[in-house]
């Protein structure tokens, strides 16, 4: 049996912007307007802002339609992106020893691409989304999820690895993008902000999330991760967007009672297994596909993402407690732990549902829609 | 060349302790996962424990507590410090490096190769 | 825990034989199953690994097939060099308690 989990009676921002009056262009914040302090090492060395591609190369995020009373991702508020990061205040952390692909943080030295050289590639992720501009491709089918409902034992590893909260999976949990498309589950993570800072990697139509989760997958075509890094398809990740609701989320609650055990960085602890597909949005049919990269190095391309249209809710005190309980590399909050977005360099973003069509005026607007490339398939 | 030595064993009474060493070359240490296994005179292999490329390690029920993996980047060498030994710990101990590369944060694993040539703890009064 | 049941436990076999040894897991593991073959004194030596996947340099006529709790290694006509243990090893995931184990072993001698 599933949890309600979704806010399921209004549509996404309808409270603050009202669904009549969607995102428009002229409201989102301009790089130059945002700090970026935020940004992550080795954003310095990858093109800014300035040199995206124009509105015709980027693509697009989508909603549910009214009827479904699901949530929109086209109908945001308009929300600052994060600014500088908080002040390191805690001396409770050792250093942890590690390879080079350890040696990395959010915000400072050393740049990304000295760490891992892929960081600087053309098609990295995460990416903002412009539900108008995604190619509506119906060979999109639903995604389907096998095994993702967990029996208590064995226990999962829950992580505070310095950059993000994992959960490590068992074998078993499978997951197709499509015919001859199939993955096992590895391991999921979040992303988050600070108090009052949203901190999703994707965003919408300039639009920052106050969280994402992601749940990592290897194509079955290979044995290991490093096997699969840089391959088209050799690694793909579910990604969904947290936001805030009336209610406590019970799913993400199994997670969020136990980070206090896992405050400082490199600690862990055993958590009862659990259903993972409850930690996602229910619908498993509206998404957006596209093909980038790894948000952390090694950044390797190739990587399938796919980015739920449906967002999950979760309590204003369940997201404050993702957000202020773990502590990072040097004696530093973990807070802020995203990746500033990338260019898109010409990708297109696709989408499993007529996303560049509703029923509010944008769309009455002249579009540019981009066409499928999996339409053959 | 990828190889693996390792040294250390020998006669121990029980209740003693004992560190191994496992001096990898062709390869660095660092970018590997890395695992001990032993086996028994006469028996099966049986896993020992495990270190990360970031340095979490995890253990067999069987020497939790008693045993511990560490390694040292800048000599290359892996270590097994065994304390409160027992006559059962009597084995021919080796370590192996992960097949490929890993990455902390993935936690996939399948195969261990190359192995070393093993050294022989012996636990005896 | 994982636990990797191995057989049979010894094996008579003549050269040129097609020779199968069997390795169950107690749980299902996907396709993380690997086979060493060990000669005494020697080290375990990678043969197959992600359960059907022939190691550098190892014969063809090795082979391993199976996947989830039943698992296969199979030498096709057997040779001189191939009268040795064998071992499966499983893999649950080695961040959870004993999620790497090895099977008991099969010993293939000479018939």
């Known amino acids: 049996q599933r949890l309600p989990r979704m806010q399921e009676d209004s549509p996404l921002g309808g409270g603050s912007s009202g669904e009549d009056d969607p995102l428009g262009e002229e409201d989102l914040p301009s790089e130059e307007d945002s700090p970026r302090e935020e940004d992550p090492p080795g954003e310095e060395d990858l093109p800014g802002e300035e040199d995206l591609p124009g509105e015709e190369d980027l693509p697009e995020v989508k909603p549910k339609s009214e009827e479904e009373g699901s949530l929109k991702l086209e109908d945001l508020p308009t929300v600052e992106a994060p600014g500088d990061p908080q002040e390191p205040q805690n001396n409770a952390h050792r250093d942890k020893e590690g390879d080079d692909q350890s040696h990395w943080r959010y915000g400072g030295d050393p740049p990304w691409p000295r760490v891992s050289p892929a960081c600087a590639g053309r098609f990295q992720s995460p990416v903002d989304i412009r539900p108008q501009l995604a190619a509506f491709c119906p060979a999109l089918r639903p995604l389907e999820l096998l095994g993702f409902q967990l029996p208590p034992l064995p226990e999962l590893r829950l992580r505070n690895n310095g950059h993000s909260v994992q959960l490590t999976l068992p074998p078993g949990l499978e997951m197709a993008l499509g015919p001859g498309r199939e993955y096992r589950a590895l391991q999921l993570h979040l992303h988050w902000g600070a108090a009052g800072r949203p901190g999703s990697e994707h965003t919408v139509e300039g639009h920052r999330f106050p969280a994402e989760i992601h749940v990592v997958h290897l194509s079955t075509a290979f044995a290991r991760v490093d096997e699969a890094l840089g391959r088209p398809g050799g690694l793909a990740v579910l990604a969904a967007f947290l936001e805030e609701g009336p209610e406590e989320n019970s799913a993400y609650e199994q997670l969020l009672s136990r980070l206090e055990e896992i405050a400082e960085e490199g600690s862990e602890t055993q958590v009862p297994g659990l259903d993972i597909s409850a930690l996602l949005p229910s619908d498993f049919s509206r998404y957006f596909q596209y093909e980038g990269s790894l948000t952390t190095p090694p950044c390797a391309q190739g990587v399938i993402w796919t980015v739920f249209n449906q967002t999950v809710m979760l309590s204003a005190k369940q997201l404050h407690t993702l957000s202020d309980t773990l502590w990072g590399p040097g004696d530093s909050r973990l807070q802020l732990n995203f990746r500033a977005t990338q260019p898109l360099n010409g990708r297109v973003i696709e989408a499993s549902f007529p996303a560049g069509v509703d029923s509010s005026p944008r769309a009455a607007e002249p579009v540019q829609l981009n066409s499928c490339l999996a339409a053959g398939d | 060349q990828v190889q693996l030595v390792e040294s250390g064993g020998g006669l121990v009474q029980p209740g003693g302790s004992l560190r191994l060493s496992c001096s990898a070359s062709?390869?660095?240490?660092?970018?590997?996962?890395m695992i001990w296994v032993r086996q028994a005179p006469g028996k099966g292999l049986e896993y020992i424990g495990f270190i990360t490329t970031g340095g979490t390690t995890y253990y067999a029920d069987s020497v939790k507590g008693r045993f511990t993996i560490s390694r040292d980047n800048s000599k290359n060498t892996l270590y097994l410090q065994m304390n409160s030994l027992r006559a059962e710990d009597t084995a021919v101990y080796y370590c192996?490096?992960?097949?490929?590369?890993?990455?902390?944060?993935?936690?996939?694993?399948?195969?261990?190769?190359?192995w070393g040539q093993g050294t022989l703890v012996t636990v005896s009064s | 825990d994982i636990q990797m049941t191995q057989s049979p436990s010894t094996l008579s076999a003549s050269v040129g034989d097609r020779v199968t040894i069997t390795c169950q897991a107690s749980?299902?593991?996907?396709?993380?199953l690997a086979w060493y073959q060990q000669k005494p004194g020697k080290a375990p030596k990678l043969l197959i690994y992600?359960?059907?996947t022939l190691a550098s340099g190892v014969p063809s006529r090795f082979s391993g097939s199976g996947s989830g709790t039943e698992f296969t290694l199979t030498i096709s006509s057997l040779q001189c060099d191939d009268f040795a243990t064998y071992y499966c090893l499983g893999v649950y995931g080695y961040s959870f308690d004993d999620g790497i184990a090895f099977g008991g072993g099969t010993k293939v001698e000479i018939k």
């Open positions: 062709g390869f660095s240490l660092n970018s590997y996962a």
């Open positions: 992600y359960a059907s």
């Open positions: 192996a490096r992960d097949r490929v590369k890993s990455y902390d944060d993935y936690g996939d694993l399948d195969a261990f190769e190359p």
């Open positions: 749980q299902s593991i996907s396709s993380y």
